[in-house]
Interface confidence: medium
């Protein structure tokens, strides 16, 4: 009846993991396509959207024939997080306007909290060093306009959907490397 | 909305060059990897290469190594495509398209290069 | 010859379901995303479907798409006239260090 009190776990399948990993991922790249589509329904802006306090893009063509496991995770994970945060700042501070995007911003807020979960489980299982805890980030300033919060909220999920999409065909080629 | 437009292609001489250029707009151009695709007369699509969003990292099919280079300036939203020891069956539609990851996920409409004596 | 193998045409009647294949080894289809693109008449590629079964803004959920080990199919349901274009599958070849296409497959509407 099962392993006794103390006895290793097995661990499960590297492969498997980081399926379900992929799977996560394309479900919450697929998520932040469908909010993009009423993002700039409800509030069309053309051109460039920036914003500088976002992570500058960490893969492409280039860099993915040199990945390494470890270094993925790591910068995944932490530019991940760093769209959480963002992600939660602009559920603080949108104004009115931008409370028509709710609940579907919160949901996306959960589902990226649970890929960083998953991601840091896979690091683990993985036996990749864990990252000691990120220093408090400075808080990022409120939007100065309904419009600059607008601009953020596209640049925002416009970065996120770029990352997931590179991190959807990161995480397929490393699956083939292990 | 994204747009690419690409420019320059025309009739060309075997074993003259060309410059294409792709005028990108609608979307952060130097967040992107860009891509060069063909299609010559009746026939399939084949990929010809691609420059990274920095332009730091290029790849290229076998088929134009040595011949063709593509570079960008980012400071304009463009990309280009400069085609040296051209020859006939480098006749086709060149395209330029944006790549969000493995995919091509806006095309521009074509310009034509015809190598022809 | 292309690396990724389709049938160079396929046809059906409005309202029927079509499915086009798309044959690939370990190197392509078995260790990347597959991606399909249509092609209307004198126009240029669009997206039509992106790491192997996802839609793009904008493409109707007619169209959907499947991988199994190393090959891959684009089906298309509730078949319509405007629907009559050339489809491409393609994916990045790891042996290549490219992106490889399929030929392509013709399809007619019929009637």
């Known amino acids: 009846p099962g392993p006794p009190p103390g006895s290793p776990r097995a661990s499960p399948d590297p492969r498997a993991e980081l399926d379900s990993t992929v799977l996560l991922t394309r479900s919450l790249l697929e998520d932040t396509r469908q909010l993009t589509i009423q993002l700039k329904d409800k509030f069309p802006a053309d051109g460039d959207h920036n914003l500088d306090s976002l992570p500058t893009l960490a893969m492409s063509a280039g860099a993915l024939g040199a990945l390494q496991l470890p270094s993925v995770l790591t910068r995944l994970r932490a530019d991940l997080l760093s769209y959480l945060r963002h992600v939660q700042w602009l559920r603080r501070a949108m104004g009115s306007s931008l409370k028509t995007l709710e609940p579907e911003l919160g949901t996306l807020q959960t589902r990226l909290d649970r890929l960083l979960r998953r991601l840091q489980l896979l690091m683990s299982r993985l036996a990749l060093p864990q990252l000691p805890p990120d220093p408090p980030a400075p808080p990022l300033a409120p939007p100065s306009s309904t419009w600059g919060g607008i601009r953020a909220a596209h640049a925002i999920l416009g970065g996120l959907h770029l990352t997931l999409d590179w991190a959807v065909r990161g995480l397929l080629l490393l699956k083939t490397r292990l | 909305e994204v747009q690419l437009l690409e420019s320059g292609g025309g009739l060309v001489q075997p074993g003259g060059s060309l410059r294409l250029s792709c005028a990108a707009s609608?979307?952060?151009?130097?967040?992107?990897?860009m891509n060069w695709l063909r299609q010559a007369p009746g026939k399939g699509l084949e990929w010809v290469g691609v420059i990274s969003y920095d332009g730091s990292n290029k790849f290229y099919a076998d088929f134009v190594k040595g011949r063709f280079t593509i570079s960008r300036d980012n400071s304009k939203n463009t990309l280009y495509l400069q085609m040296n020891s051209l020859r006939a069956e480098d006749t086709a539609v060149y395209y330029c398209?944006?790549?969000?990851?493995?995919?091509?996920?806006?095309w521009g409409q074509g310009t034509l290069v015809t190598v022809s004596s | 010859q292309s690396v990724l193998t389709q049938p160079p045409s396929a046809s059906g009647t409005p309202g029927q379901r079509v499915t086009i294949s798309c044959s690939g080894s370990?190197?392509?289809?078995?260790?990347?995303?597959v991606n399909w693109y249509q092609q209307l008449p004198g126009t240029a590629p669009k997206l039509l479907i992106y790491y192997d079964d996802l839609l793009p803004s904008g493409v109707p959920d007619r169209f959907s798409g499947s991988k199994s080990g190393t090959s891959a199919s684009l089906a298309i349901s509730g078949l319509r006239s405007e629907d009559e274009a050339d489809y491409y599958c393609s994916a990045w070849d790891d042996s290549l260090n490219g992106v490889v296409f399929g030929g392509g497959t013709k399809l007619t509407v019929l009637g």
């Open positions: 609608g979307f952060t151009f130097s967040h992107y990897d």
């Open positions: 370990s190197s392509n289809i078995g260790n990347n995303a």
């Open positions: 398209a944006r790549t969000p990851g493995s995919h091509f996920d806006y």
